[in-house]
């Protein structure tokens, strides 16, 4: 899997999970989240050559098309596969609220 | 939706469905498919600026992060959303076979 266990240990130009820490206040301008101050969002990036981690039949055909026709510009793209939620603490007035924000953390990637 | 109805009618630099006809023999080197000779596979391409058809909470956050930090390289990517199957006719010896290949045709796109 193109996850942290593999991608953070290997220098990889191809599609892989990349580390990204987002500070809510500095990076997003969000002052309303009390905890955490930021989180490891991560992101997916890198080339999708030669059937690298192809996700669907279409991405496999597209990858094959690109492999055979290298001048083509219709290549698959490196995107998130598995995502996890993030639990945050914020306040409405003086009332603390705990919320789980879905699909906030990327855990693995694919070529799609 | 970033589908043919919208994308094929508008000149769009942002993420959109793009037409791509694949000729099985010429483009993939496949001689074994009897019918069809090729098909409209289509593909997704284009930029994913702030909130352009963002797919998940993470792609929305990433999009916002990129807007606030334009030097960042962690942008969402334009990929397939809805896919459809393709029915093919081929032969095993002299016996005709009809097969439905799943996820062969892209119908719409998203920023993920």
């Amino acid at each position: 899997a193109l996850d942290a266990a593999y991608c953070f240990r290997n220098v990889q130009d191809n599609c892989c999970l990349r580390p990204l820490y987002i500070d809510f206040k500095r990076d997003l301008g969000w002052k309303w989240i009390h905890e955490p101050k930021g989180y490891n969002a991560n992101f997916c990036a890198g080339a999708c050559p030669y059937l690298w981690s192809s996700d669907t039949q279409h991405s496999r055909v597209l990858s094959l098309y690109n492999t055979i026709n290298p001048e083509a510009s219709a290549s698959p793209c490196c995107v998130s596969q598995d995502l996890e939620p993030l639990t945050i603490l914020y306040y409405i007035g003086k009332t603390p609220k705990i919320e789980q924000l879905s699909n906030m953390i990327v855990k693995s990637c694919k070529c799609s | 939706a970033l589908d043919a109805a919208y994308c094929f009618r508008n000149v769009q630099d942002n993420c959109c469905l793009r037409p791509l006809y694949i000729d099985f023999k010429r483009d993939l080197g496949w001689k074994w498919i009897h019918e069809p000779k090729g098909y409209n596979a289509n593909f997704c391409a284009g930029a994913c600026p702030y909130l352009w058809s963002s797919d998940t909470q993470h792609s929305r956050v990433l999009s916002l992060y990129n807007t606030i930090n334009p030097e960042a390289s962690a942008s969402p990517c334009c990929v397939s959303q809805d896919l459809e199957p393709l029915t093919i006719l081929y032969y095993i010896g002299k016996t005709p076979k009809i097969e439905q290949l799943s996820n062969m045709i892209v119908k719409s796109c998203k920023c993920s």
Epitope: L64, I68 | E99
Partner: nanobody, 114 residues
Amino acid sequence: QVQLVESGGGLVQPGGSLRLSCAASGSIFGVFYMGWFRQAPGKQREMVAISTDDRTSYVDSVKGRFTISRDNAKNTLALQMNSLKPEDTAVYFCNLNQLGTDYWGPGTQVTVSS
């Protein structure tokens, strides 16, 4: 069900040659592609070369050194590897994609070392 078995791996010195073979058995039809992939320790499996009915393609790092060939009558796939380099060291896998389903052989070890 398709079965694949590779052979021809071994230890070779840098600059040397090896020929890998793959025998496919079972009902072979609707082949998207047949190919050779490799996996070095701690790395992802990567494509080396693929063959469709009348096209071949190679990863950049092996172009001009490796040649893939297919014998449809015998259901075999071969990979002629010349001018081998230490970075070619890996387990090499034969792959057949039939109507979108991948079939893999168990792999054969290729070690390039002096």
